[in-house]
């Protein structure tokens, strides 16, 4: 990996698990200042592979609320507005990092966790395997 | 929000910024044991709104590598394999949490940061604004 020169002003860590356990400031810095959150808000409805968003809530996780996409159809919407099975709607999934309270119910102690979430759906050409 | 009963075995925090600053174990727990990572690996190529994946690396961020999707076309691929501009390829974006080293170059001190990433692309019907 890349070696990072250590800043002499870094906090000290006496933790025996260091560098496994680190200090994290939860005061979130939002880098998305130039983005318009409205911009993609209706793609779920206008897509040829439309999806619904389901709320997944877990108070032991940070963030506690995550929205999961579920494709509305197995096929894709064609030019006539019909569901066409010659194409397939599939979820686009992404691995994201969340914080899991550990030990459980602790407000100030977490463990990083990797979870797979469905963000939206896309329309793909199916792979057809014919029987010989 | 939901009130979580405090676990008596929680680590103590003498930090004056508590609960802004928390302890995080970086030993990642992966919840994706039942998922097949191969399954969605070729969607980017088979989609009617195909995309390329670009590597975004930042040693001051955790995770340091993030893959960003960029739609290949403005239109969508039709049944003939041509780009059809009656439909639009658009990126599906998601806000994710990352850890930003703060102060810079510190191995054990971070701040949560929210960033917007493009995960893949979907094909949508364009919104047509006619001139009166």
């Amino acid at each position: 990996g890349i070696t990072i020169p250590r800043n002499p002003g870094c906090p000290n860590s006496e933790d025996k698990n260091f560098p496994r356990t680190v200090m994290v400031n939860l005061n979130i810095h939002n880098r998305n200042t130039n983005t318009n959150p409205k911009r993609s808000s209706d793609y779920y409805n206008r897509s040829t592979s439309p999806w619904n968003l389901h709320r997944n809530e877990d108070p032991e996780r940070y963030p506690s609320v995550i929205w999961e996409a579920k494709c509305r159809h197995l096929g894709c919407i064609n030019a006539d507005g019909n569901v066409d099975y010659h194409m397939n709607s599939v979820p686009i999934q992404q691995e994201i990092l969340v914080l899991r309270r550990e030990p459980p119910h602790c407000p100030n102690s977490f463990r990083l966790e990797k979870i797979l979430v469905s963000v939206g759906c896309t329309c793909v050409t199916p792979i057809v395997h014919h029987v010989a | 929000g939901i009130t979580i009963p405090r676990n008596p075995g929680c680590p103590n925090s003498e930090d004056k910024n508590f609960p802004r600053t928390v302890m995080v174990n970086l030993n990642i727990h992966n919840r994706n044991t039942n998922t097949n990572p191969k399954r969605s690996s070729d969607y980017y190529n088979r989609s009617t709104s195909p995309w390329n994946l670009h590597r975004n690396e930042d040693p001051e961020r955790y995770p340091s590598v993030i893959w960003e999707a960029k739609c290949r076309h403005l239109g969508c691929i039709n049944a003939d394999g041509n780009v059809d501009y009656h439909m639009n390829s658009v990126p599906i974006q998601q806000e994710i949490l990352v850890l930003r080293r703060e102060p810079p170059h510190c191995p054990n001190s971070f701040r949560l940061e929210k960033i917007l990433v493009s995960v893949g692309c979907t094909c949508v019907t364009p919104i047509v604004h006619h001139v009166a």
Epitope: C71, L74, G81, V90, H130 | -
Partner: antibody, heavy 118, light 111 residues
Framework: QVQLQESGPGLVKPSETLSLTCTVT?????????WSWIRQPPGKGLEWIGF???????SYNPSLKSRVTISRDTSKNQFSLKLSSVTAADTAVYYC???????????WGQGTLVTVSS | DVVMTQSPLSLPVTLGQPASISCRSS???????????LDWYLQKPGKSPKLLIY???NRFSGVPDRFSGSGSGTDFTLKISRVEAEDLGVYYC????????FGQGTKLEIK
């Protein structure tokens, strides 16, 4: 308890349009699931005709597509089948069912026999 | 279109004995999302079909555990461990991964 009930004429003349309605009770057809029509000619097997999704889009059996229209009336919680230019080959028991588009047919109507004859 | 071929078309059985019905698709019915939408239905004379098994191997609620489904890709099987009188009727396999299609049916009858 979800219940489906087919209704419509039992006799249709050749070249005319067959029209059936399915009334659903115990579940809103616009809240979830696809809502399908399936038919069974006397002494033969089952054939999927098409569905209308809770969100509105339809899908039809390619072999019947040019003659089929499925629509709905959410205010009455009903969905309907229209099959045009019928022939004797369209004589069958017609069933409506909840399911299709990834969901199994878990609830069925009792079926209605439609005979095409002059 | 995907053609679903069942065998045998007629299956004479002795009550209390096992029975097995095969269903083969003309192409893979694994959807691009990784799921296989293969169901089994039982239709008794003069009645509407009833769902037994969904997504290859999942028993629908209320279905006795003597019914089991298995298979993958293009080859699927419905097994009844011990046939009871109430199991007699016509069994249909169904695929919903592509434009939906039923198999032609297998009649389970007393030997």
């Amino acid at each position: 308890q979800v219940q489906l009930q087919e209704s419509g004429p039992g006799l249709v003349k050749p070249s005319e349009t067959l029209s059936l309605t399915c009334t659903v009770t115990g579940y809103s057809i616009s809240s979830d699931y696809a809502w399908s029509w399936i038919r069974q000619p006397p002494g033969k097997g089952l054939e999927w005709i098409g569905f209308i999704s809770y969100s509105g889009p339809t899908s039809y059996n390619p072999s019947l597509k040019s003659r089929v229209t499925i629509s709905r009336d959410t205010s009455k919680n009903q969905f309907s089948l229209k099959l045009s230019s019928v022939t004797a080959a369209d004589t069958a028991v017609y069933y409506c069912a909840r399911g299709g588009d990834g969901d199994s047919f878990d609830y069925w109507g009792q079926g209605t026999l439609v005979t095409v004859s002059s | 279109d995907v053609v679903m071929t069942q065998s045998p078309l007629s299956l004479p059985v002795t009550l209390g004995q096992p029975a097995s019905i095969s269903c083969r698709s003309s192409q893979s019915i694994v959807h691009s999302n990784g799921n296989t939408y293969l169901d089994w239905y039982l239709q008794k004379p003069g009645k509407s079909p009833k769902l037994l098994i969904y997504k290859v191997s999942n028993r629908f609620s209320g279905v006795p555990d003597r019914f089991s489904g298995s298979g993958s890709g293009t080859d699927f099987t419905l097994k009844i461990s011990r046939v009871e009188a109430e199991d007699l009727g016509v069994y249909y396999c169904f695929q919903g991964s592509h434009f939906p299609t039923f198999g032609q049916g297998t009649k389970l009858e007393i030997k």
